[in-house]
Interface confidence: medium
């Protein structure tokens, strides 16, 4: 007799481990024989899906191959034209070992910052995550938290969270473990020790003091007077994070010194600085005609005319005094190559000391002119026949603005070393020296001996620079 | 006739060193400064260091200082370039050239053949 | 630091005017950087031109003379021939203590 379909062994839920086997069994007494059909969240699955395999005349569904979306509600429903169509649902849970999805990554953080390491998971029962600092579990407190997502949250990162993280996912099929990462805290500049002020005397040593910290350690720049540093010795030592730079300076001028601290973060540069103020006892700003200060020479062409450790004057007209002097002399140097021998050791000393004038430097920085016999016998023993020939071409403008080349000096404008012998400067290297006899024989009295000369230059200025080039 | 010859140049390791040379001849080699001029194989010229006349000062690009040492003997009217630490970048032909005074600087009137120095592996 | 710059290559025909450029990637050249101008045939060591902008070395031809052009050096060679094809350099002083002679990088001239 016909018999309505009847199930007898209802689905069940299936737990599966991913990869592994699941089989629903949905058991029907009736005649005829029914018609069963399978149907995974409502859509029917087909009889010719590989992933399936439907026997036992359609009793019995098997996933060959557990993935983690065949999670759903699997109903069988069978029919054979005697009553009503049955239905029986059951439940897959596709359960999963831990895995970590995203892990954290390395993590460059400037202290005072909010750090997320990231560390996304997936299984199934949902695993719990938890983190590792170091060898230690990390403890949550006020400024860490494991998010709900499992990334690790670090308000108002400080140095000691610094360090190696991990994650770690664990449900009751097994454990997770992401790869170490790092947590490195940059800390932004910052001066522990500023220079101190000083108020010395002219000529005197100060050493400026700065110390300065911060991740990476800090570079220490000096800057004086808006420029950097261009004299003077600086000794750095770095030890536990902290940088020390000390700068040794002979003071020869007041002035602002600043130090500059300065590490990077990224593309980004922190900075912190400090200034201290030398200033001179009973310094006075120079005299108008006297712009400038004396310093000790530190050039490379005049060091073996002038004396040793000289204290020469250098001109602020010009924006670096030094490189401008030094560059005139150079120039006007290579143009003594070609006068005479006799002539060109008189000039050399004539040139450098008119360029370098010794300085003397009292309140008021002054520079002392040579004094005129001295430039005399250059023009009218040493180098005459030179001396009249540059004049000449000077008169005549032969001499290009770039070739800046001095042009002849006017010894009767120099002061006399008979009216003040301290008022203009001697060239000691032009003095005939009986018991060390130089190349130049002695002179009569009328002129002092003369032996190896520079160039003058006084306030009044005998020597001028072609006044078209700018050393600036 | 004025002469710079170079010598010293040669195939060394990454962070290796060697000592380059200059022989000069021709002129007063202790009233001119002198520089090494380094040439990549295919690039352009880049200043490397130089020294005044006395040698009483030094100067160096950025990249090679606190490596390399330049100096002077002027009584053998020798230059010498010693490059420690050296990196491949350094591989170039490197020239000695004679300054046109005293000063550190000033154009190099005068230029030796080069010697090839090839930092590699 | 600044990057010296100049045309990376420039043609001129036998007998032309042709002028080369050299400038700072900030700022303008002055009569403070000494502008100096090196020739380099292929397989050769370089050669000094011009010096402090226009100052010419003994036995360099007339043809070749240095100047400025707006805020740049300029060397021109006035009636080009075969034997000027080569690499050009100009070279920048930088001073202020540094002391440094910076190069550009070179300007491939052919005499077609």
């Known amino acids: 007799l016909p018999k309505a379909p009847v199930i007898t062994t209802p689905l069940e839920t299936v737990d599966a481990l991913v990869e592994e086997v699941a089989t629903f069994m949905c058991a029907v007494e009736s005649y005829p024989q029914p018609e069963i059909s399978w149907t995974r969240n409502k859509i029917l699955i087909k009889l010719f899906d590989t992933r399936y395999s439907i026997r036992e005349n359609g009793q019995l569904l098997t996933i060959l191959s557990v993935e983690d979306s065949d999670d759903g509600i699997y109903c069988c429903t069978a029919n054979n034209g005697v009553g009503g169509a049955v239905e029986s649902c059951g439940a897959l849970q596709v359960k999963m070992k831990p895995k970590i999805t995203r892990p954290p990554i390395n993590v460059k953080i400037i202290e005072g910052l909010k750090a997320v390491l990231p560390c996304t998971t997936m299984g199934n029962p949902k695993p719990s995550v938890s983190w590792i600092k170091g060898d230690s579990p990390l403890r949550e407190n006020s400024r860490t938290a494991v998010l709900e997502s499992g990334s690790l949250r670090i308000h108002n990162v400080q140095k000691e969270d610094a360090g190696q993280y991990r994650c770690v996912a664990k449900n009751s099929l097994g454990t997770a473990y992401s790869k170490v990462v790092k947590l490195e805290v940059e800390v932004f500049a910052r001066i522990l020790r500023a220079p101190e002020s000083h108020n010395v005397t002219f000529g005197s040593f100060v050493t400026l003091h700065c110390t300065a910290t911060g991740i990476p350690v800090p570079t220490i720049t000096w800057i004086e007077n808006g420029n950097a540093v261009s004299s003077g010795s600086i000794q750095e030592s770095v030890k536990d994070r902290v940088i020390d730079s000390r700068l040794q300076l002979f003071i020869t001028k007041p002035g602002l010194y600043t130090c500059i601290a300065t590490n990077k973060h990224g593309e980004k540069f922190s900075t912190a600085k400090a200034a201290a103020t030398v200033s001179i006892a009973e310094w006075s700003k120079p005299q108008k005609d006297n712009k400038g200060y004396c310093a000790q020479y530190r050039g490379e062409v005049c060091n073996a005319v002038l004396a040793k450790d000289a204290l020469v004057f250098l001109n602020t007209s010009y924006a670096d005094p030094e490189e401008a002097q030094e560059l005139l002399v150079h120039t006007a140097w290579n143009e003594l190559k070609v006068v005479s021998p006799l002539c060109r050791p008189a000039a050399e000393a004539l040139l450098c000391n008119h360029v370098f004038q010794e300085c003397s430097p009292g309140v008021v920085p002054t520079p002392i002119p040579i004094c005129r016999e001295y430039c005399l016998a250059v023009k009218e023993l040493f180098c005459a026949k030179e001396w009249l020939a540059m004049e000449e071409k000077t008169h005549r403008g032969l001499y290009r603005s770039e070739m800046h080349l001095l042009s002849v000096p006017e010894c009767s404008k120099l002061p006399s070393m008979h009216w003040d012998p301290t008022a203009c400067a001697r060239l000691p290297h032009l003095d005939y020296n009986k018991e060390n006899p130089k190349t130049f024989p002695p002179m009569t009295s009328s002129k002092p001996s003369v032996d190896i000369p520079n160039l003058p230059s006084s306030s009044s200025s005998s020597f001028s620079v072609s006044p078209t080039y700018s050393m600036t | 006739e004025l002469q710079l010859v170079e010598s010293g140049g040669g195939l060394v390791q990454p962070g290796g060193s060697l000592r380059l040379s200059c022989a000069a001849s021709?002129?007063?080699?202790?009233?001119?400064?002198m520089s090494w001029v380094r040439q990549a194989p295919g690039k352009g010229l880049e200043w490397v260091s130089a020294?005044?006349?006395?040698?009483?000062?030094?100067y160096y690009k950025e990249s090679v200082k606190g490596r390399f040492t330049i100096s002077r003997d002027n009584a053998k009217k020798t230059l010498y370039l010693q490059m420690n630490s050296l990196k491949s970048e350094d591989t170039a032909v490197y020239y000695c050239?004679?300054?046109?005074?005293?000063?550190?600087?000033?154009?190099?009137?005068?230029w030796g053949q080069g010697t090839l120095v090839t930092v590699s592996s | 630091q600044a990057v010296v710059t100049q045309e990376p290559s420039l043609s001129v025909s036998p007998g032309g005017t042709v002028t080369l450029t050299c400038g700072l990637s900030?700022?303008?050249?002055?009569?403070?950087?000494?502008p100096d101008w090196y020739q380099q045939t292929p397989g050769q060591a370089p050669r000094a031109l011009i010096y402090?902008?226009?100052s010419r070395l003994s036995g360099v031809p007339s043809r070749f003379s240095g100047s400025f052009s707006g805020n740049k050096a300029a060397l021109t060679i006035t009636g080009a021939q075969p034997e000027d094809e080569a690499d050009y350099y100009c070279?920048?002083?930088?001073?202020?203590?540094?002391?440094?002679?910076?190069f550009g990088g070179g300007t491939k001239l052919t005499v077609l």
């Open positions: 050239a004679k300054r046109s005074g005293r000063i550190a600087f000033g154009a190099l009137d005068a």
């Open positions: 021709g002129f007063t080699f202790d009233d001119y400064g």
């Open positions: 020294i005044p006349w006395n040698g009483g000062s030094t």
């Open positions: 900030s700022g303008s050249v002055t009569s403070s950087n000494y």
């Open positions: 402090s902008t226009n």
């Open positions: 070279a920048l002083y930088m001073g202020s203590g540094s002391r440094n002679y910076v």
